[in-house]
């Protein structure tokens, strides 16, 4: 503990200027005081001043009032500091002395004489209020007051409680009169070292290092740290707990990066095509006729449907097509003929019938042939007659199915596993291979099962020029060439503009 016993001298009266021994002072009693403070004694005895002692300079002559003085010599009130717990009781001896010597340091002068002394014994609590007293004897009177106060940073009824106000890392407080800590605004805890976080700051998710702050723990955000942060990789999602990725409407996948409404958000399908939110890329485009490509961005060739008739060649134009007709034909699709039945325009055994009083004609085609001049062989593969992945082939007036290993039959409808079933026709030799039976055929036969009789194919020698398509007719030596754009002639051998010098049927 630590405190100060303060004694305020107010007035000393010695009207006759007398000493304690009855003698008078010449020319007057030059008065100074000695104060001795010690522990409580029922009977005051000589001995050490256990609580402290102090002397004053000369304060006056005979009778005088003592003014308060805060510094230098003659300080009043007098200060008697102590460094222990104040016990609450004391003994005080105040002596008035006359000195013939130095005013400032009378203690050191020889020949000092006692004028009077008083002794006070009793209890005294620590406090700021002065206790006032007056002592008289036959010759003198002393008015004074005293108190005990605690030194700076010491508090309590015995000045035993140390409290030093601070505002740093170790605490933020002032001191109450009893020495207890009074936290500065925004701080709490035994030593006022815990900040009071922003009001509403989440107790678990948030913390603070200074008042009115709310710092979020990992995974939380917001003013009060009550809102989570989604996963690092999350793209179009939210969370209800940290690092979650709950997808926004229209998004899917672990990180909500798959667009479930790609069609709506991006409109990838072009040219009036239909978009579906499905498929490996999250969408599929269904094209309108005449368009193709992943996004239906590619226009199909307008010539793809072979609109030009009678050997006319087709050329694509921006939004249409144009037919270049061979000699003897005209019209948008070369559908009109300048020929008559006299020109024998019907191929493949077609019968010619006069029309419009002989100014035009119409061909009646035999089975398996079509076209305005019976020039096209009917494609019997259009109905996909071959089962089990068999490949359909047009062969003269009929068609055959080329079966995958392990299958046979006219339509590849029969499943075979080995040569035990004698799959090879016309005396073919069967070989049992890993992918199914293979037939080695005798002369005059071909096909996977030796089922095809080899006949002469008029198109086999490639009689058509300039990339024309060859069609065989009813007789083995008959063929028709379908010319590409820019060429005419029975073998498509003439560029447009040159007269043909050969008949149409070779």
């Amino acid at each position: 503990g630590s405190g100060i016993f303060q004694l305020r001298l107010q007035e000393f009266v010695n009207q006759r200027g007398m000493l304690a021994n009855g003698q008078s002072c010449e020319p007057g009693c030059r008065t100074f005081f000695r104060i001795c403070l010690k522990h409580f004694q029922a009977t005051f005895s000589e001995g050490p001043c256990t609580f402290g002692n102090v002397s004053t300079p000369v304060l006056g002559t005979n009778s005088f009032v003592v003014r308060d003085k805060n510094s230098g010599s003659g300080r009043n009130p007098l200060q008697l500091p102590f460094n222990f717990t104040w016990p609450g009781t004391f003994s005080l001896n105040i002596q008035a002395w006359h000195t013939p010597g130095d005013d400032l340091r009378p203690e050191t002068s020889p020949g000092n004489s006692l004028i009077s002394q008083i002794i006070i014994q009793g209890s005294l609590a620590v406090g700021k209020i002065w206790r006032t007293d007056e002592q008289n004897d036959t010759l003198t009177r002393l008015s004074y007051s005293y108190r005990v106060i605690c030194s700076d940073n010491y508090y309590g009824e015995s000045c035993s409680r140390l409290c030093k106000k601070r505002d740093d890392h170790f605490g933020h407080y002032e001191c109450q009169p009893d020495g207890s800590l009074s936290c500065l605004p925004g701080w709490t805890g035994k030593y006022c070292d815990q900040p009071i976080c922003l009001s509403g700051c989440h107790e678990q998710n948030g913390y603070c290092s200074k008042p009115d702050e709310c710092i979020c723990r990992p995974g939380w955000q917001g003013r009060l740290c009550n809102e989570c942060i989604p996963h690092n990789g999350c793209r179009h999602g939210t969370c209800s707990i940290p690092w979650q990725c709950a997808c926004d409407e229209g998004w899917g996948g672990l990180f909500c990066d798959q667009d479930l409404n790609y069609c709506t958000h991006h409109s990838p399908c072009k040219n009036g095509s239909t978009c579906s939110n499905s498929g490996p890329k999250g969408y599929t485009c269904t094209c309108l006729p005449g368009y193709t490509g992943e996004h239906c961005e590619l226009g199909l060739s307008k010539c793809a449907s072979n609109p030009c008739r009678n050997g006319g060649s087709c050329k694509d134009q921006e939004n249409s097509y144009h037919c270049l007709c061979p000699p003897g034909y005209y019209g948008q699709h070369c559908e009109h003929s300048t020929l008559t039945c006299a020109d024998s325009p019907c191929f493949n055994g077609g019968s010619c019938r006069e029309r419009n009083q002989g100014s035009s004609y119409a061909c009646e085609c035999p089975p398996n042939f079509t076209g305005s001049n019976c020039e096209k062989k009917v494609d019997r593969c259009t109905s996909n007659p071959c089962a089990n992945g068999g490949q359909c082939q047009n062969r003269g007036p009929s068609r055959t199915c080329r079966c995958r290993p392990g299958f046979t039959g006219t339509h590849c409808e029969l499943h075979i596993s080995d040569c035990a079933r004698s799959p090879c026709a016309h005396g073919g030799t069967c070989h049992d291979l890993e992918n199914g039976p293979v037939c080695t055929c005798p002369a005059g036969f071909s096909g996977r099962r030796c089922e095809v009789r080899i006949t002469h194919d008029a198109c086999a020698s490639g009689p058509c020029f300039n990339g024309a398509t060859c069609y065989t007719g009813l007789s083995p030596n008959n063929f028709v060439c379908n010319c590409p754009y820019g060429f005419v002639g029975s073998r498509c051998e003439f560029p447009v503009g040159l007269p043909p010098s050969f008949p149409w049927v070779a």
């Epitope: 723990r217 995974g219 917001g222």
Partner: antibody
Framework: EVQLVESGGGLVQPGGSLRLSCAAS????????MAWVRQAPGKGLEWVAT????????YYRDSVKGRFTISRDNAKNSLYLQMNSLRAEDTAVYYC???????????WGQGTLVTVSS | EIVMTQSPATLSVSPGERATLSCRAS??????LAWYQQKPGQSPRLLIF???NLADGVPARFSGSGSGTESTLTISSLQSEDFAVYFC?????????FGQGTKLEIK
């Protein structure tokens, strides 16, 4: 694909101001907290400021407090950094990044250079 | 604030070999640590978060480990594209702080 594109950098005198912008795409911007991180030439990375996704709460490193302001416009998918009273020590490449002060910075922009010099 | 110290400042390793980079925090960061890769003229790229979780699209040759104050980034078999500067970052305490970086160069 997540993309963050910064703009607004340039040369400015000490005491001057600049406003940086960051355009975000490829993710739902309003769902995520955002930040600015800077890198002085030839030096390491330094967090500058953060803004929450929900209520726009902001945090700043001590050296820029009172001078810099981070903000966002969720309708425009944009993040901003208003820089006032610029000092020479603010010279750096400023990166826009997705993240908070208490989470990793998952995505970064290409950066914009701010040079403070007289 | 927490101080992050990376070592070594420069590491020379041959392609195909193993590289080990270290990061130390001045106090416990409870696994709240990330690693970034930065190539010259480019922005940083997140490699690892929460000490040992691989970020999306990062090759499996990268791995992270550690606890408390010590963390390690390991690249099992170095590829030519792995030579860059690597930064660690703690996000456990406010403010977030980065290490000064380790430059990984070809030996």
């Amino acid at each position: 694909e997540v993309q963050l594109v910064e703009s607004g950098g340039g040369l400015v005198q000490p005491g001057g101001s600049l406003r940086l912008s960051c355009a975000a795409s490829g993710f739902t911007f309003s769902n995520f907290p955002m930040a600015w991180v800077r890198q002085a030439p030839g030096k390491g990375l330094e967090w500058v400021a953060t803004i929450s996704s929900s209520d726009g709460t902001t945090y700043y490193r001590d050296s820029v407090k009172g001078r810099f302001t981070i903000s966002r416009d969720n309708a425009k998918n944009s993040l901003y950094l208003q820089m006032n009273s610029l000092r020479a020590e603010d010279t750096a490449v400023y990166y826009c990044a997705r993240g908070y002060y208490n989470s990793p910075f998952a995505y970064w922009g290409q950066g914009t250079l701010v040079t403070v010099s007289s | 604030e927490i101080v992050m110290t990376q070592s070594p400042a420069t590491l020379s390793v041959s392609p195909g070999e193993r590289a080990t980079l270290s990061c130390r925090a001045s106090e416990d960061i409870y696994s709240n640590l990330a690693w970034y890769q930065q190539k010259p003229g480019q922005s940083p790229r997140l490699l690892i978060f929460d000490t040992n979780n691989l970020a999306d699209g990062v090759p499996a040759r990268f791995s992270g480990s550690g606890s408390g104050t010590e963390s390690t980034l390991t690249i099992s078999s170095l590829q030519s594209e792995d030579f860059a500067v690597y930064f660690c970052q703690q996000y456990n305490n406010y403010p977030p702080t980065f290490g000064q970086g380790t430059k990984l160069e070809i030996k």
